[in-house]
């Protein structure tokens, strides 16, 4: 029996013989749509932001993270109705007084032109044409993402 | 050029030639440790519970969900230091006055013996020996999980 110290909370020894490539998805599952190197799931039903975050998490995916304006536009092109809003993985951090992605990075102010206030309990939604600040308790649709292609030597350090 | 309606927010037609099998992980990525049919990542840095939930999500994983006492014990055996606490995917639902897993299910009271209060802004952490209720704003380590084995025809229902 190994001691708990030898076991170690992250037993890298075990992983020595394992792939350092994240297997990833080779294809998008049913209900998910491919957009470049991601699979996206556009929900039909609605949830507050927190529940949307949890739903994506239980699907082993993430609320949508948008890299730049180009990715925003390509995502918006997949939204079929002007009136529909979708939560993405961006909300207002009161302590840092800034918009923060759920991966811990801050919004580059050039990336998204947000309509609405930057204040406590504000979360970001996108529509076919715009980006909005909404109360996080609002029930709207949401977008989950999974990375599609295998990513080599991506080791998921702490955010 | 397809109309936005034909593109549809989730164009399942594209997925027709794609697998309906969720590929899953065949091996745990580096830094993750296998425990039965799961890969676990024990963080080294600390975060409030909400940020921990978000971090797991961006890693396309979930805060740890514990099925029963047996799984709890096996997980605790991997914790190397008695003094370290780790967030798991369980918090107090004020509206339902009950402990709730992030997949929406309620805690079976026999599963975990929780030390501390069941009240607003309480989240659950585990140590090498115990299960604690802590203020969700407390910055401690956390555990993410990924399912290891491929699951056929799983369109991501309940965990």
């Amino acid at each position: 029996q190994k001691s708990s110290i030898e076991k170690c909370s992250v037993d890298i020894q075990q992983s020595r013989n394992k792939t350092t490539e994240r297997p990833g998805l080779l294809n998008c599952p049913i209900y998910w749509q491919q957009l470049r190197e991601k699979c996206l799931l556009f929900s039909h039903t609605v949830n507050p932001w927190n529940n949307s975050l949890a739903d994506c998490s239980t699907k082993e995916s993430s609320l949508l993270l948008i890299r730049d304006k180009d990715e925003l536009i390509h995502t918006q092109n997949l939204i079929r109705d002007k009136a529909i809003l979708f939560w993405i993985g961006l909300n207002f951090s009161l302590s840092e007084k800034n918009w923060k992605w759920i991966n811990g990075s801050f919004l580059n102010s050039n990336d998204l032109e947000i309509r609405g206030d930057a204040k406590e309990n504000s979360c970001i939604s996108i529509s076919q044409t715009s980006v909005y600040s909404e109360y996080c308790s609002t029930e709207i649709r949401w977008i989950c993402q999974k990375e599609l292609t295998p990513v080599r030597n991506k080791v998921y350090p702490d955010s | 050029q397809k109309s936005s309606i034909e593109k549809c927010s989730v164009d399942i037609q594209q997925s027709r030639n794609k697998t309906t099998e969720r590929p899953g992980l065949l091996n745990c990525p580096i830094y993750w440790q296998q425990l039965r049919e799961k890969c676990l990542l024990f963080s080294h840095t600390v975060n409030p519970w909400n940020n921990s939930l978000a971090d797991c999500s961006t890693k396309e994983s979930s805060l740890l969900l514990i099925r029963d006492k047996d799984e709890l014990i096996h997980t605790q055996n991997l914790i190397r230091d008695k003094a370290i606490l780790f967030w798991i995917g369980l918090n107090f639902s004020l509206s339902e006055k009950n402990w709730k897993w992030i997949n929406g299910s309620f805690l079976n009271s026999n599963d975990l013996e929780i030390r501390g209060d069941a009240k607003e802004n309480s989240c659950i952490s585990i140590s090498q020996t115990s299960v604690y209720s802590e203020y969700c704003s407390t910055e401690i380590r956390w555990i993410c999980q990924k399912e290891l084995t491929p699951v056929r025809n799983k369109v991501y229902p309940d965990s």
Partner: antibody, heavy 121, light 107 residues
Framework: EVQLLESGGGLVQPGGSLRLSCAAS????????MSWVRQAPGKGLEWVSA????????KYADSVKGRFTISRDNSKNTLYLQMNSLRAEDTAVYYC??????????????WGRGTLVTVSS | DIQLTQSPSSVSASVGDRVTITCRAS??????LAWYQQKPGKAPKLLIY???GLQSGVPSRFSGSGSGTDFTLTISSLQPEDFATYYC?????????FGGGTKVEIK
């Protein structure tokens, strides 16, 4: 195993009211939008109403709008349908139904056995 | 509202036959179509989701195809337990709507 069990049906006069319940088990009820679907004797299926997972958003078929109210109690894993101003054409078996995925309103992979509502004088 | 028109409304067939049922939507619904089987006195049972996804536990003799407005449910070799009524359902837009049903009877 997912189980949905409807109750509350029965005979009621036109203009009367009934409250249907659906007790859910075997899945995390509160992650899913839920629906009521009905089937008149010898007829096809008709979607009646849906409610979001949290319960703040409700949707209705035009035929019942303003008369029926859908609600849920996630702490009791129970779905409800309050039916007022009932008409003869509301006579049907009422099913509660769960969607296959938590992101969907429909594609129902679990149904109750149904409860019969008869509106007649 | 989106109308779904099923054809035929009934079909007589023998065990072993190949049976095809069609469902036409009044406007494009991408692949947001499901198929159900219902037997007398029973609740419907999901067979196919997302136009072509076979629901877990459903025999592989059932298959679905189509996209946009025209969809097909095929039973490759009819079995005695397949005699029932079949419904299509669209989930692309609310209100959710069902087709009128196709009754598969013994010849």
């Amino acid at each position: 195993e997912v189980q949905l069990l409807e109750s509350g049906g029965g005979l009621v006069q036109p203009g009367g009211s009934l409250r249907l319940s659906c007790a859910a088990s075997g899945f995390t009820f509160e992650r899913y939008a839920m629906s009521w679907v009905r089937q008149a004797p010898g007829k096809g299926l008709e979607w009646v109403s849906a409610i979001s997972a949290v319960g703040g958003t409700t949707k209705y078929a035009d035929s019942v709008k303003g008369r029926f109210t859908i609600s849920r109690d996630n702490s009791k894993n129970t779905l409800y349908l309050q039916m007022n101003s009932l008409r003869a054409e509301d006579t049907a078996v009422y099913y509660c139904a769960k969607p296959l995925d938590s992101s969907l309103w429909a594609d129902f992979d679990a149904w109750g056995r149904g409860t019969l509502v008869t509106v007649s004088s | 509202d989106i109308q779904l028109t099923q054809s035929p409304s009934s079909v007589s067939a023998s065990v072993g036959d190949r049976v095809t049922i069609t469902c036409r939507a009044s406007q494009g619904i991408s692949s947001w179509l499901a198929w159900y089987q219902q037997k007398p006195g029973k609740a419907p049972k999901l067979l196919i989701y997302a136009a072509s996804g076979l629901q877990s536990g459903v025999p592989s003799r059932f298959s679905g195809s189509g996209s946009g407005t025209d969809f097909t449910l095929t039973i490759s070799s009819l079995q005695p337990e397949d005699f029932a009524t079949y419904y299509c359902q669209q989930a692309s837009y609310l209100p959710i709507t069902f087709g009128g049903g196709t009754k598969v009877e013994i010849k």
